[in-house]
Structure formats: structure tokens, C-alpha cells
């Protein structure tokens, strides 16, 4: 079932800003970008060309089984989970200790769901009651997008615990959190 | 210059097999995700593969599943697409798609496309 | 399969003048983690590859003039362009890449009158 075939290793993306012959799409000097009628937003910069590259998002695959209450599917489902840091990353002073230290700065990058896939699994719950079936949206693929879209945090509560899990490093914030926050088949984990 | 140049089109009967390559060139081919997109004759666009930068994740249409299979070697630049059990509806134009390798995913640059005609 | 319905089929425009193309999507295609949504317009002049023009719902690709902008939110987009030109001519796709399988519109075939 679903689109993907699997297979048991990790996806580590770690691409090398400086051995571009061209700048990445989204480097290049596009004006219309910040336009009025682009919200406002720029585009994604996870670093600018002259950063140094901290750039790891992989894609891990995870099986597990959905649950609905008391009710489990019959078969394990697999999908991804999405792990590690984006950058940027710079090397800052510490007007403290004079020394120095790496501090991210910019846009909030974060490794994180950026494709779905359908999946529908057979639900079989105690007691005698008849199996059931459920549509469950997994997660396909990761990428290191900014979630600085957001004007209000809270509109991410329907990923719950998985929409806060901190990077490393970093202090989680708080996210509001919904009823259907634990419900397996929301958990879009990354 | 960014380059996809497809290659391995051609005239193949119904239950024949084909294999189509993408060349890559003018980026670091390994940090991209890959497409296949076909158009057959007259018509729309229609997806048809996804590959990760590994190749560790692929994804398929219902419409080619169990018949075709995405592959890559990163370390010849290289993206392909093996195509078994052919059908006259798989008649179409191939084109390879790259995706960007960070932030929005749409398919920033497109190859020129081969033909590929199933007949009898 | 998310469904792309895409109208019209055919818009015939005078040089000059504005053209809309709806796109309406069976589904959201808001990714809730990031807030993006994930639509893009592509255009495929005749005899061409096709090539990106807007992605994410609203934001021109390199090199894309601004005359061409995106809009919409939840299932229903819109691209605009507000004064048509000449070179404009060829069939305009949305797609959808919020879930696989990815799934284009039917395409919109812009001509001049």
C-alpha cells in the first residue's frame, strides 16, 4: 500500500553551498520577492552564500503502529521521521568571555515534514467489535523549511508535541496544544 | 548552466520495456530530489516518480506502479527511469524535474523531454 | 489523489488586457507544520518543457515578471496576470505537492484573439 518503497537507512542531505556552479534558485538576487504582493516574505535563505554551511536534515524511516483509543491497525505502518539541524549557523563574539560560539541567526530553519502520503490501515479494536478502516496522512518526505510563516504560534496545534520538539541547542517554545494532539493518525511526527 | 537532458526514447510494442536516463549536469546532483513527469500527445501533465537525493525514499502514480522503477547513481549524475510492461497509455513525452534542495519544493528546472510511442 | 480542476480550458486575450485562471484543489494543501501552501503554477509555452512560474501560492519564480502573481488560500487559487503580453501564449498547470501522488490541473490554454 501507499507510494513508497522503503528502504532500512537514513537520507542525509548535506549539500555543499560552495561547490555550486550557480547559486541555489532561492540565492539569487530576485527583487520581486519582497514585494507587497509576497506578503513580505523573503524566500527561504537558510544561509547566505558566504555562511558557513550547517546543513543536515535526514529522513528516517520509523514503523510503528497506528492507534485510535484502544483500537490498533492490524499491520505497522511506515514513515518518515524527520531529524537533524538546518542552518544557518554563525560564529558570533561573546562579548563575555571574548571568546566565540555558534549561534543560529535569520529565519527559523527547522528540518522539518515537507510531503504526505495517504495511507489507509485496518483498525482492530478489543471486545469484539468489528475492524475498522482509517485514512492515515504519513509523512514523505522532510526539508529544511522556515516556520517563521506563522504570525501565531498556536495555529500549529494540530501537530502537537511533534510541532515543538526543540533542535539541539535550542530552548523548546511553547506551542499550544489541541485535544487531537495524540491521536496517532495527526502525528506527523519530525 | 543547469542541464537535464533526457535520452532512451523510442518505439516499443504493447508488453515491451524501455529505460529512459536523465543527464544532470551544472549542480551537485546528489543534494537534489528527482521527478519523472510525462505528457502523453494533446493532453495535460502527469506526475509519474519521485526519488529522494539518496534514493532512499520513492514514490510512484497508481498508474505505473509495479511496472516502472526510479533509480539514480549519484556518482554518474544520473537519474532513470526502467519502464516494463508498457501499455499504449504510457505513450507520451518523459521529462525530468528537479526539485530545490531546501525550503519550497517545486520543480525549478525541466529537461527537454523524450518521446516515448507504444504500438503495435 | 488530491484532484486539481483547473478553469477555464481556454481563455482567449486581448494584448494589454488582465486573465484570470482558477485552480480548486479537492483537498487543503496547507502544510500546518510550516504554514506554506503548497501550490505551484507552471507554464508550458508551445513546443517547450514547462517551466516554473509562481510557487508556494504566491511567490514568482527567478526571473518571472511581475506581471504574473498568485493567490488564494484553503482549495481555491488564482493566477493573475495583469496585463497580457504577446509571449504569455502557451498552457498554464497548477499542481499540488502537499502529498503523493503529486497531481496537476488540466491546464488552462492562453491564446491571443
Known amino acids: 500500500q501507499g507510494w513508497q518503497a522503503f528502504k532500512n537507512d537514513a537520507t542525509e542531505i548535506i549539500p555543499e553551498l560552495g561547490e555550486y556552479p550557480e547559486p541555489p534558485p532561492e540565492l539569487e538576487n530576485n527583487k520581486t520577492m519582497n514585494r507587497a504582493e509576497n506578503g513580505g516574505r523573503p524566500p527561504h535563505h537558510p544561509f547566505e552564500t558566504k555562511d558557513v554551511s550547517e546543513y543536515s536534515c535526514r529522513e528516517l524511516h520509523f514503523t510503528r503502529y497506528v492507534t485510535d483509543g484502544p483500537c490498533r491497525s492490524a499491520k505497522p505502518v511506515t514513515e518518515l521521521v524527520c531529524s537533524g539541524q538546518c542552518g544557518p549557523a554563525r560564529l558570533l563574539p561573546n562579548a563575555i568571555g571574548r571568546g566565540k560560539w555558534w549561534r543560529p541567526s535569520g529565519p527559523d530553519f527547522r528540518c522539518i515534514p515537507d510531503r504526505y502520503r495517504a495511507q489507509r490501515v485496518q483498525l482492530l479494536c478489543p471486545g469484539g467489535e468489528a475492524p475498522r478502516a482509517r485514512k492515515v496522512r504519513l509523512v514523505a518526505s522532510c526539508k529544511c523549511k522556515r516556520l517563521t510563516r506563522f504570525h501565531n504560534q498556536s495555529e500549529l496545534k494540530d501537530f502537537g508535541t511533534e510541532a515543538a520538539r526543540p533542535q539541539k541547542g535550542r530552548k523548546p517554545r511553547p506551542r499550544a496544544r489541541s485535544a487531537k494532539a495524540n491521536q496517532a493518525e495527526l502525528e506527523n511526527a519530525y | 548552466e543547469v542541464q537535464l537532458v533526457e535520452s532512451g526514447g523510442g518505439l516499443v510494442q504493447p508488453g515491451g520495456s524501455l529505460r529512459l536516463s536523465c543527464a544532470a549536469s551544472?549542480?551537485?546532483?546528489?543534494?537534489?530530489?528527482m521527478n519523472w513527469v510525462r505528457q502523453a500527445p494533446g493532453k495535460g501533465l502527469e506526475w509519474v516518480s519521485y526519488?529522494?537525493?539518496?534514493?532512499?525514499?520513492?514514490y510512484y502514480a497508481d498508474s505505473v506502479k509495479g511496472r516502472f522503477t526510479i533509480s539514480r547513481d549519484n556518482a554518474k549524475n544520473s537519474l532513470y527511469l526502467q519502464m516494463n510492461s508498457l501499455r499504449d497509455e504510457d505513450t507520451a513525452v518523459y521529462y525530468c524535474?528537479?526539485?530545490?534542495?531546501?525550503?519550497?519544493?517545486?520543480?525549478?528546472?525541466w529537461g527537454q523531454g523524450t518521446l516515448v510511442t507504444v504500438s503495435s | 489523489d488530491i484532484v486539481m480542476t483547473q478553469t477555464p480550458l481556454s481563455l482567449p486575450v486581448t494584448p494589454g488586457e488582465p486573465a484570470s485562471i482558477s485552480c480548486r484543489s479537492s483537498?487543503?494543501?496547507?502544510?500546518?507544520?510550516?504554514?506554506?501552501?503548497?501550490l505551484d503554477w507552471y507554464l508550458q509555452k508551445p513546443g517547450q518543457s514547462p517551466q516554473l512560474l509562481i510557487y508556494?501560492?504566491?511567490y514568482r519564480a527567478s526571473g518571472v515578471p511581475d506581471r504574473f502573481s498568485g493567490s488564494g488560500s484553503g482549495t481555491d487559487f488564482t493566477l493573475k496576470i495583469s496585463r497580457v503580453e504577446a509571449e504569455d501564449v502557451g498552457v498554464y498547470y497548477c499542481?499540488?505537492?502537499?502529498?503523493?501522488?503529486?497531481?496537476f490541473g488540466g491546464g488552462t490554454k492562453v491564446e491571443i484573439k
Open positions: 524535474a528537479r526539485e530545490r534542495y531546501y525550503g519550497d519544493t517545486p520543480f525549478d528546472y
Open positions: 551544472g549542480f551537485t546532483f546528489s543534494s537534489y530530489s
Open positions: 526519488i529522494s537525493s539518496s534514493g532512499s525514499s520513492i
Open positions: 483537498q487543503s494543501l496547507l502544510n500546518s507544520v510550516d504554514g506554506s501552501t503548497n
Open positions: 508556494t501560492l504566491s
Open positions: 499542481m499540488q505537492r502537499i502529498e503523493f501522488p503529486l497531481t
